[in-house]
């Protein structure tokens, strides 16, 4: 991959250990926790990132617990099981043999059960709604300029194909970014919207996973765009299966 040999690091993932032990002495990086080789020219899967986050010693963690608003971790942090491609396994269990089914972004989509719980397939999250509230500014941002800036961000920083950014809505101070990506639309090599959303979430919280420049510099016509609250909603291709008791 693209980590240079003179200083063996992974530009797209801080949570790695790298060494020049690849073919021809090329730099090879492995995710903390799983030890899986990662491609440093693109985003690392969310599953491997969460696993790395859980494996890091508490005093060495570069990432903090998400705020109460981050629906992605409603059940708290957990050490996920990832498949050989780095995706979430459909069934996740904790150390006390409590199990549940997750979607492709690792969010629980069923009631919790025991080891007998079956999760037949990994259900794809095909629609992600990122709801942001920006800090007060002198005036509202121009909608088309804001739209262009956020689309540019997802294209450049996360390498997400522009067609997957379905819409950017704005009613001051609320910004909504809609990401859509059906199974049939996602080609080999395409960044997954779930991974892009997770990197964005970490960036917005000032916990960038990238090396180098690190933090975001979001600006609309030179005016800083500072986010003070983030909510992320996930919609799956197949609706979740929760009992009525939970819904009440």
């Amino acid at each position: 991959h693209t980590a240079a040999q003179d200083n063996c690091t992974c530009p797209t993932n801080k949570m790695t250990v790298c060494s020049p032990d690849g073919p021809g002495g090329r730099c090879q990086c492995r995710a903390l926790g799983s030890g899986m080789a990662v491609d440093c020219s693109t985003l690392t899967s969310k599953c491997l990132l969460l696993k790395a986050r859980m494996s890091a010693p508490k005093n060495a963690r570069t990432l903090v617990r998400p705020s109460e608003h981050a629906l992605v971790d409603n059940d708290g942090l957990y050490d996920p099981d990832c498949d050989p491609e780095g995706r979430f396994k459909a069934r996740q269990c904790n150390q006390t043999s409590v199990c549940w089914c997750v979607n492709s972004v690792g969010v629980r989509r069923t009631d919790k059960g025991d080891l007998s719980l079956r999760c037949d397939e990994l259900v794809r999250t095909h629609h992600i709604l990122i709801d942001l509230r920006h800090r007060p500014t002198a005036g509202a941002f121009n909608h088309s300029d804001l739209d262009a800036e956020l689309r540019r961000l997802f294209r450049e920083r996360y390498r997400l194909h522009p067609k997957f950014v379905a819409a950017v809505h704005y009613e001051q101070p609320t910004i909504q970014i809609e990401l859509r990506q059906n199974t049939s639309q996602k080609a080999a090599g395409d960044v997954d919207i779930g991974d892009a959303a997770y990197y964005f979430e970490r960036d917005i919280k000032g916990e960038s996973l990238f090396q180098g420049r690190g933090g975001l510099d979001l600006r609309v016509r030179g005016e800083p765009l500072q986010v003070e609250r983030t909510l992320i909603y996930y919609l799956d291709e197949i609706p979740p299966k929760f009992s009525m008791k939970r819904l009440t």
């Epitope: 693209t2 980590a3 240079a4 003179d6 200083n7 063996c8 690091t9 992974c10 530009p11 797209t12 730099c27 440093c40 540019r152 961000l153 450049e156 920083r157 990238f210 090396q211 180098g212 420049r213 975001l216 510099d217 600006r219 016509r221 030179g222 800083p224």
Partner: antibody, heavy 126, light 105 residues
Framework: AVTLDESGGGLQTPGGGLSLVCKAS????????MFWVRQAPGKGLAWVGV????????NYAPAVKGRATISRDNGQSTVRLQLNNLRAEDTGTYYC???????????????????WGHGTEVIVSS | ALALTQPSSVSANPGETVEITCSGG???YGWFQQKSPGSAPVTVI????YRLSDIPSRFSGSASGSTATLTITGVRVEDEAVYFC??????????FGAGTTLTVL
Amino acid sequence: AVTLDESGGGLQTPGGGLSLVCKASGFDFIDYDMFWVRQAPGKGLAWVGVINRSGSYTNYAPAVKGRATISRDNGQSTVRLQLNNLRAEDTGTYYCAKGVCTHCWDADSAGNIDAWGHGTEVIVSS
Amino acid sequence: ALALTQPSSVSANPGETVEITCSGGSGNYGWFQQKSPGSAPVTVIYNNNYRLSDIPSRFSGSASGSTATLTITGVRVEDEAVYFCGSADSTYVGLFGAGTTLTVL
């Protein structure tokens, strides 16, 4: 059309300082990173440094680190390279260049340059 | 790496396809054409495979892993120049190759 016009070159004395200015037009200057690249006589291109669009971030090549300062004035659409403690090896043509990928995690890469100035020649000699 | 690795020279007959490779970088690659020493470089390819609108379609770029390739399909006499590749190392310092001289026979 994008135009980048460098000025400030000429004969400089060793140990002294120089200030090169690049005036940009033809694009929204406030939205793009800017680079300085130099080329010694008969040699290849050498990356000097980069400044992000807001001016809050700069990065420099080891050969000029500690001696170079890149700054920008978004109101005037100008970017400046200040280089102190000049050496003979600083001799060459200095190019201002426009970046295209300000959010990229590899935004400092020379691979993100999409436009160049005509260059200004600097000679460091006593 | 202090510089990216690219061949010092390549040659081809008019109409042939030329490939120039570049390796050792981290991040995006670009390709820059310089027709004579001291003349301003011209960006042929940026961000691995993006071509500027005024660059002929016979120029294309690709990147796989840490290697990039500039391809000129149906090379012309006017394509004679020195071609520099550009990228960065993993410490985010920009890098260029030493240049490849393209001779059209």
